[in-house]
Amino acid sequence: ILGGREAEAHARPYMASVQVNGEHLCGGVLVAEQWVLSAAHCLEDAADGKVQVLLGAHSLSQPEPSKRLYDVLRAVPHPDSRPDTIDHDLLLLQLSEKATLGPAVRPLPWQRVDRDVEPGTLCDVAGWGIVSHAGRRPDRLQHVLLPVLDRATCNRRTHHDGAITQRMMCAESNRRDSCKGDSGGPLVCGGVLEGVVTSGSRVCGNRKKPGIYTRVASYAAWIDSVLA
């Protein structure tokens, strides 16, 4: 997260760290007791490493009573996701067992009504992604509030030049932005999961290259079918 600040510890109990061989790779969001939603491209970066999900964490390194690392029973990328595009960049991870719920571990309600968030709405994005252009990684969860950007502006030639489909949404990126390592994490508007950080190799913090988020409401049928 660029231009953000440290989050209040455990105030986002849905927040997950998707890890490979014990290292944070991507963000994720607990959407059901045994399921974490993330970004499909995160799996590509995992190669053949052991994928696990950390829940109940604020610090990645320090011991915390609520922290627990779960093995992944099943990884289900969206069937239409492709390495060369950010379309359908969603991944569902089934945990080896149901998460132990509590004040620091709780699923987040996700948007099912397929309607765009009003431009200008302030939404919260959180993650353990880099906090500087130099690539510094934080130990503790960071967050930032970002205004939603209308799709027409996001589709301008100097922005994303028509690449933003109806299944995506954008948020402003003027110095405050999600960045590398935040992919798969939640964009939360009014206490509801609206978007998932896409995992393209986008420049961060440049206002002409807004953050791109996969709209979960557009994938309600797929999410329901996998969770069923």
Partner: antibody
Framework: EVQLQQSGPELVKPGASVKISCKAS????????KNWMRQRHGESLEWIGD????????SYNQKFRGKATLTVDKSSSTAFMELRSLTSEDSAVYYC?????????WGQGTLVTVSA | DVLMTQTPLSLPVSLGDQASISCRSN???????????LEWYLQKPGQSPNLLIY???NRFSGVPDRFSGSGSGTDFTLRISRVEAEDLGVYYC?????????FGGGTKLEIK
């Protein structure tokens, strides 16, 4: 299939105004800016301005400020350009184009002829 | 405004020949975001312009690979490796990096 259908040719008298339209189909109208260009006979293209169909925000080429006014009607997925105080210099083909990707989609053009 | 100057004005070619069109801007058209929004359009007689190349060298979908774009800064070139009859028309370069966006004066590709 993305289509931009422009209104038909106009023959107008000097000093009058004209309003030409550009109806979009095959995509969600509010997802892309609409741009307008002018092309006088045998000449190159000039950018007039653009409009965000979500909120009506406009940007104009200084050269066309006071000459062109851009508007949209979201309910009919139509963009409009009004040209006022017309002179023979305004006789041209006027194009609308969707921005994104680039100007990949153009209307067929509307010929405006200013003549007494 | 950024002035885009195309040369030549007219380019007579034989079918199967290579054709090159030059486009120069009077200032750099690198955008503040680092990208260069230089595009090429072909306008056939009585038709609207068609996008060929965007961001200097990227072919738009459906554009044959005989079309290629190159250049940087202020100096850009469109090349057609083997001219076909359907390629005839007026070619325009365009810069979208600075407001107002501007087009070149056009180059007419015609049969020799």
């Amino acid at each position: 299939e993305v289509q931009l259908q422009q209104s038909g040719p106009e023959l107008v008298k000097p000093g009058a105004s004209v309003k030409i339209s550009c109806k979009a189909s095959g995509y969600t109208f509010t997802d892309y800016y609409k741009n307008w260009m002018r092309q006088r006979h045998g000449e190159s293209l000039e950018w007039i301005g653009d409009i965000n169909p979500n909120n009506g925000d406009t940007s104009y080429n200084q050269k066309f400020r006071g000459k062109a006014t851009l508007t949209v009607d979201k309910s009919s997925s139509t963009a409009f350009m009004e040209l006022r105080s017309l002179t023979s210099e305004d006789s041209a083909v006027y194009y609308c184009a969707r921005e994104g990707p680039s100007f990949a989609y153009w209307g067929q053009g509307t010929l405006v002829t200013v003549s007494a | 405004d950024v002035l885009m100057t195309q040369t030549p004005l007219s380019l007579p070619v034989s079918l199967g020949d290579q054709a090159s069109i030059s486009c120069r801007s009077n200032q750099t058209i690198v955008h503040s975001n680092g990208d260069t929004y230089l595009e090429w359009y072909l306008q056939k007689p009585g038709q609207s312009p068609n996008l060929l190349i965007y961001k200097v060298s990227n072919r738009f979908s459906g554009v044959p690979d005989r079309f290629s774009g190159s250049g940087s800064g202020t100096d850009f070139t469109l090349r057609i490796s083997r001219v076909e009859a359907e390629d005839l028309g007026v070619y325009y370069c365009f810069q979208g990096s600075h407001v107002p966006p501007t087009f070149g004066g056009g180059t007419k590709l015609e049969i020799k």
